[in-house]
Every structure is written in C-alpha cells, then in structure tokens.
C-alpha cells in the first residue's frame, strides 16, 4: 500500500482544468525531496510531465504547474485547457526517479455532452443573467409564449406571456419582445444559481403547430484563482464583478463551512483579525475593486470570495469571484517583531525589510487608518517629505544593500499608537505591518539633552550635551540635523583614544555638539542617538532656535519640542573598554530636488513613486565645524 494518497479517479470535460492534490507522509525527507507527475505508458514506463525541480514537458508548456506545500505535506498539480488527449493513467510521486513512492491517478477527459441538434447552449457564471432568444412563426404571434424547465417527467413552467411566473423565478424572470419584431420573444433570468442550470424549452403556440426551441443553460461556479504567497508577505485580491453591480456595496469574505465570513466590505465592516493589515480600494465605476492584505499569517490560507450586494454580505445569485490562497511557511521575508513598544516622550527605531535585490527602490512608511475603506497615508519616504505634523520627530534611514531600512519616530505620544506599514515601490509582497504600542513613561529617559531651553546666538559658540547611561558604552553615539528629507548624521572622526577603564560613572557619560560659529542655517531640530553598525537605537530630539545678538535670548520653544526621551529599546550590553574621543563634525550635505508628496498608499506600489534625485540629507551649504565631545570621568 502506497503511503502517498490522492484522487484515484479524476473526470473532466474538454476545456476545463484540474487541480490534483497528492498527500505524502510527514517526514523531513519527504518535504524536501523531488515531487513529480508522470504519465504511464503501455510499457509500464512513467514519463515525467512536470516536477518540483523545474522540469516542464512540451505538452504541458504554459498550462500546468506543480506546487509543494511542505507545511501541509501535500503537493498540487494544476493542469488547464484539458483535451481528450490528456485522458490516461498517471502517477504523482516523490523521489529522485519515477520509481519512488507514488500513487496512481486515472484522468478521463470527455467531450462536452451531446445535446439535441437544435439545442442552443448558454453558458453563464453564477450571479449573472441570461437572455434566452425564442424564435417563432408569424402565425403563432397571437398565441401564448412560455418558457419551461425540463424535469425528469415533465416541463415545469418558468414564465409565460399571461404573466404566470414560477415562485422560484419571481422577480428574476421577465418575458418580453423587442420593438415591432413579431418573430422572436425573449426571456431574461437574472441572479442565476446552480439550481437554474438545465434544459429549458421555449414555446409559442399550442399543439402540433407550436414553435419549440431547446435551450441548455449551464451555470458555472467561477474557477478559483490559485494564489501562492509567502508567510509575512502581502496579497492583493483584484475583483472585477462588472458594471451591473458597480453601485452595490462590495465585500471580501472567507469560506467557513456553510457560510462565507465577511472580512471587509465597503460599508465599514472589518474582521478584527485583519485590523491594521487590510485595505479595500474601489478602482473605477465598472465595479472593479481590490483588497490588499499585508502581514500574511498561516491561518490566512483558505478560500476567499469577493462579491457585491447592497447589504455588503454574500447573497446567492449575485456575481462572485473566488480565490484559493496558499501561505507558504518557507518564506523569504525575514521574521521581524510585529509589535514594537515605546513609551511617551521616548523613541522607537523600526527595522523595515525589503527585497535585497531591489536596494535602489524607494522606501516608504505609512500609517494605516481604519476609517471608511481603510487607507495608509505615507508619513515619510526616501523621496517623500516628512508630513508636517511629524516635523522634527520622524526620519527614514536607508541602508542600501542590506535588505533593511530604518524608520525612527521620537517624542512619542499615546496618539502615535497604531498600525504602520513598511513598503517600497518595488516588490509589493514585501509590505509588512508593525503595530506600535505606546505606554505612559514611568522612569527617567536614557538619553537626555542639556540645556533643555536651546536658544543659540548668531555668531557665537553654542554647545548642547547628550547624556547617556553606561549601557550605551559599546554603542556609537551620533548627532544628526533633522530636515524633512531625513536626519543627516554629522560626520565625525576619532581624535585619539584613551586607555581602557572598567569603571563607569553613570552621571557623567555625554556626547556634546558644538556649533561654532552659530549661523542662521543652524536653526532647527537636532537628534542625539545611539546605534550599533546599521542598527539604530534610541534617539532624543531638541529644537535649537537661533537669535541675533541684539535681541534677548529668551525663546519660546515649540510645544513638547525638547520633551525628555524615554527608553524604547533596551540593550543589556555594557562595554568596559572606553575610549576618549573628540570628533569634529562638518555637515556638508547636497541639496535635494523638490519632490511631490505621496498622499496615500493604495494597492499598487507603482502609484507610490515619487520623482526627485536622491542625495545626502539636508543641511547647510556653508562649512561649519560641529564638535562632539565625549567626556569620561
């Protein structure tokens, strides 16, 4: 007895497609070994048609695929555009040769069944409507017209010209004639269901002189589109239901036994399991819309259906489109924290993954908002200016080539809590969702800037100090000047090292920045932060106002501008090797070209492109010397 299992018999008709699932025992070897589908010949030899190693035979080219689902211990063979030539005996199996573990599958492809020669075939999808044409001779013009549906013994009336209507067709069937043409009548049936499929007879007149026409109505379920997505990636369901439902509410639901549970609709309903990671976007006036889901989970796999109805809920007899979503757990998308925690006044550094093959793609960060159909306005991007309300507290650091960019948000408030998306204008599968949780601060911040009231006087020297705890010894400290294009790290170089010491005075660790002489361009936001290589840690922000010598030096800071920072990420490392540094920082950034702001994230990453040239982040055109002092006692 073979341990492989699948359907022994598959019967289909020409033009249809099959999706054959083969189950294999749950072992590591089985999950990773070659999977194949072969056709058995008279000699007993089995000729490979497709395998998981990438082989595809000529006769299957463009119409078949084989996909392994190691987490389910199954693999699936999809074959489209079947012909009678596909009838035969096959094997699905595992192993390096076609003599490994296998299972026999018989595939029979028949011709579409023959119908009486005068039968007119109408093929329609569920939920659509059909207009049946019934010709008749002029002499039967005054006679009764009717349409009936054949049952085993009789023909059950659907509708006739005396306005008799079968109860199951009330409100769905209409019998009418067009213009002055007295040789044809029409019957329109709307909201078709599987039960409407079958043979019908339309008739004009009675007895032997009656005109009759045979009609075969085929009502088809939409074939599910197969979607294969990686864990943590995103999927877009593109739904095109047609103009006739353009004005109806739209929905996406997931099959669950007898019901289809609505995940989202355009009336504001949303499944809590998809909070923060779903958008529904109407596309045009023709009934097209799309649903984007990010941060795919294993449990998101299943049968999905989109549809339209005034209730925003699935209704029998309304048009639908279906998908089977498979979620592959062997994902290329790195497993990152989906929840980031911060405290009021503190900061968070969020590492956003992107496809490393697309290091030059534009990177964005948007905030998911659930009102209406859901939307995700971009807050910051590689070439998108920071939104005004985030001035001085949000920046994106791109680290080309390593598959990660970092978004830093500081001066946190509880209103910052919510869902955020990392995305690029490249591979849309790499959209990821982060939930930011902000708790009330309960202790002193790790980084603290003095003086808190930072007003520098034009032409003079001005120093600000950033105090940090011992645990940040081993980390690189930096100051950067913020602009709405980013936070330009002020360059520094080591000017000699001090001998190692194992002591650390908690109160006296600081890194200072000196502006000498102060110029008008120095006005603005500055950040003090820590990082380890390309991994950014905490930051705190300060606004430095610049006043002329003649004026008093009192200055009203922007609200919360120099709020104390709090711990968001806690490193436990304390490095005992300490070096004395004096660094000269000479900010000399290049100008940025103007770029349009990206307002919103829909479901096409391409829509998120912004024009403009990349360059170093903002700053001054003059050469000024900023000094960073590390004082160790």
């Amino acid at each position: 007895k073979s341990p492989i299992f699948g359907p022994q018999e598959v019967s289909s008709i020409e033009g249809d497609s099959v999706s054959i699932t083969c189950y294999y025992p749950d072992t590591s070897v089985n999950r990773h070994t070659r999977k194949y589908w072969c056709r058995q010949g008279a000699s007993g030899m089995c000729t490979t048609l497709i395998s998981s190693n990438g082989y595809l035979s000529k006769e299957y080219s463009g119409r078949a695929n084989l996909i392994n689902f190691p987490e389910n211990n199954t693999f699936v063979i999809n074959i489209e555009q079947l012909t009678q030539d596909d009838t035969g005996s096959y094997k699905c199996g595992l192993g390096t040769s076609n003599r490994g573990l296998s299972f026999d599958v018989s595939l029979e492809v028949s011709q579409v069944p023959e119908l009486p020669s005068d039968t007119h075939v109408y093929t329609k999808d569920i939920g659509r409507n059909v207009t049946i044409e019934c010709p008749f001779k002029r002499e039967n013009a005054p006679s009764k017209k009717s349409l009936c549906k054949k049952t085993n013994q009789s023909c059950e009336l659907v509708i006739d010209s005396t306005e008799k209507v079968n109860p199951s067709y009330i409100g769905r069937a209409k019998l009418f004639m067009k213009g002055t043409d007295l040789t044809v009548f029409y019957v329109n049936i709307s909201h078709l269901t599987h039960n409407d499929a079958g043979l019908y007879i339309c008739q004009a007149g009675e007895g032997p002189s009656a005109d009759k026409k045979n009609v075969d109505l085929q009502v088809l379920a939409p074939e599910p589109e197969l979607l294969y997505k990686d864990l943590r990636s995103s999927v877009t369901f593109e739904c095109d239901l047609g103009r006739e439902v353009a004005n109806e509410a739209k929905y996406l639901c997931r099959m669950n036994k007898e019901t289809c549970d609505v995940i989202i609709n355009t009336l504001g309903k949303r499944d809590p399991d998809f909070e923060g990671r779903i958008l529904i976007t109407p596309k045009d006036d023709n009934g097209r819309f799309s649903v984007l889901i990010t941060g795919l989970r294993k449990e998101d796999a299943g049968h999905y259906q989109c549809g339209a109805h005034s209730s925003g809920l699935p209704q029998e007899g309304w048009p639908i489109q279906t998908w089977q979503l498979f979620v592959n757990e062997e994902s290329t998308i790195p497993n990152r924290r989906s929840v980031v925690k911060g405290v009021t006044g503190g900061s968070v550094a969020i590492a956003c993954p992107y496809n490393p093959k697309e290091s030059s793609s534009l990177k964005y960060w948007c905030r998911w908002e659930g009102d209406g159909n859901g939307h995700c306005p971009v807050l910051v991007g590689t070439q998108a200016q920071v939104q005004e309300e985030y001035e001085g507290r949000l920046a994106l650091f791109d680290q080309p080539g390593n598959g990660t960019y970092t978004v830093i948000l500081n001066q946190l408030t509880t209103e910052d809590a919510g869902f955020y998306w990392c995305l690029t204008n490249g591979d849309s599968r790499w959209r990821t969702t982060i939930e930011l949780q902000v708790a009330e601060a309960t202790r002193e911040p790790n980084l603290e800037v003095t003086p808190q009231n930072a007003t520098a006087v034009l032409g003079e020297t001005f120093t600000v100090s950033c105090h940090y705890p011992c645990k940040f010894y081993s980390q690189e400290k930096y100051w950067c000047k913020w602009s709405n294009k980013g936070c330009h790290i002020l360059p520094s170089h080591d000017e000699g090292a001090r001998q190692s010491s194992v002591s650390c005075d908690q109160s006296s660790q600081l890194v200072s920045m000196t502006l000498n002489p102060v110029s008008k361009e120095d006005e603005g936001w500055y950040w003090c932060g820590v990082k380890q290589g390309q991994t950014y840690g905490e930051t705190t922000a300060i606004y430095i106002a610049v006043e002329e010598r003649t004026r008093g030096s009192s200055h009203v800071n922007p609200t919360d501008a120099n709020a104390r920072a709090k711990v968001a990420l806690e490193e436990e490392v304390v490095d005992s090797s300490i070096s004395e540094k004096e660094n000269k920082a000479i900010p000399n950034p290049g100008p940025f070209a103007n770029e349009r702001e990206i307002q919103n994230v829909g479901d096409q990453a391409q829509e998120n492109r912004a024009s403009g040239d990349a360059g170093s982040a903002d700053g001054q055109s003059r050469s000024s010397s900023s000094k960073h002092h590390h004082h160790h006692h």
Epitope: E9, S12, V18, N256, E258, G302, H303
Partner: nanobody, 125 residues
C-alpha cells in the same frame, strides 16, 4: 438547518450489490467535498470514498484501498445528493455507513463538517 440523510442500506448476500444515497437538503452542496465513512462493531470509523466537484465539469474521486475497484462514488449536484454504488460485497463490508460533508481544503480528511445518522449495511455469507 443542515441535515444529511442516508438511505439504501440493508441486508445483502456476499457477492451482491447495494446503492447508498445521501440527501443533503439545506447544504450548499456544490461547495462541499462529500464522503462516505463506515464503522464496523468494535472498530474505529474509517474512510470509504469521497468526491469533490469544481463547480464546472470536473469530479475528483477518492477511494480506500479496501473498496477500490468494487465501489463507485457519484454526486448529482442538481439534486443535492451523493451515491455509493457497491458491488461484489464481502462480509467484511458489514458496517454502519455514514455520509459526511467537508470543506474542500488541503487537509480534508482531517475532519468533515457535517455527518449523517448512518445506514446499516449487512453482508451475509
């Protein structure tokens, strides 16, 4: 209310035939994988056969080794009914036969969603 109602069971001599039927009023029949399971006295319930339909022209039939070649499963989607034609019956086919309906997903025989009350099939030697 979903109900699965089996019929067609009975007493038959070894070598004889029986056709079991399962009616599923109230079920969106076309969306379901339909199956037959059986349970002999003192034994676990075991899989017999199952059938899927893709809503178009394709049917997938699954059989347990014990009935393969002797049984044929079919379904009439218009009548919401499934059938199991059993030929060359053996005494070891004696059991209560249950009709079941399950979502068509990858791990299908991990569990069916709806079950009938069962119909007794007795094969005498």
């Amino acid at each position: 209310q979903v109900q699965l109602v089996e019929s067609g069971g009975g007493l038959v001599q070894a070598g004889g035939s029986l056709k079991l039927a399962c009616a599923a009023p109230g079920l969106t029949f076309s969306s379901y994988r339909m199956g037959w399971f059986r349970q002999a006295p003192g034994q676990e319930r075991e899989f017999v056969a199952a059938i899927d339909w893709n809503g178009r022209g394709t049917y997938y039939r699954y059989y347990a080794d014990s009935v393969k070649g002797r049984s044929t499963i079919s379904r009439d989607n218009a009548k919401n009914t499934m059938y199991l034609q059993m030929n060359s019956l053996k005494p070891e086919d004696t059991a209560v036969y249950y009709c079941a309906a399950g979502s068509i997903d990858l791990n299908w025989y991990g569990g069916m969603d709806y079950w009938g009350q069962g119909t007794q099939v007795t094969v005498s030697s």
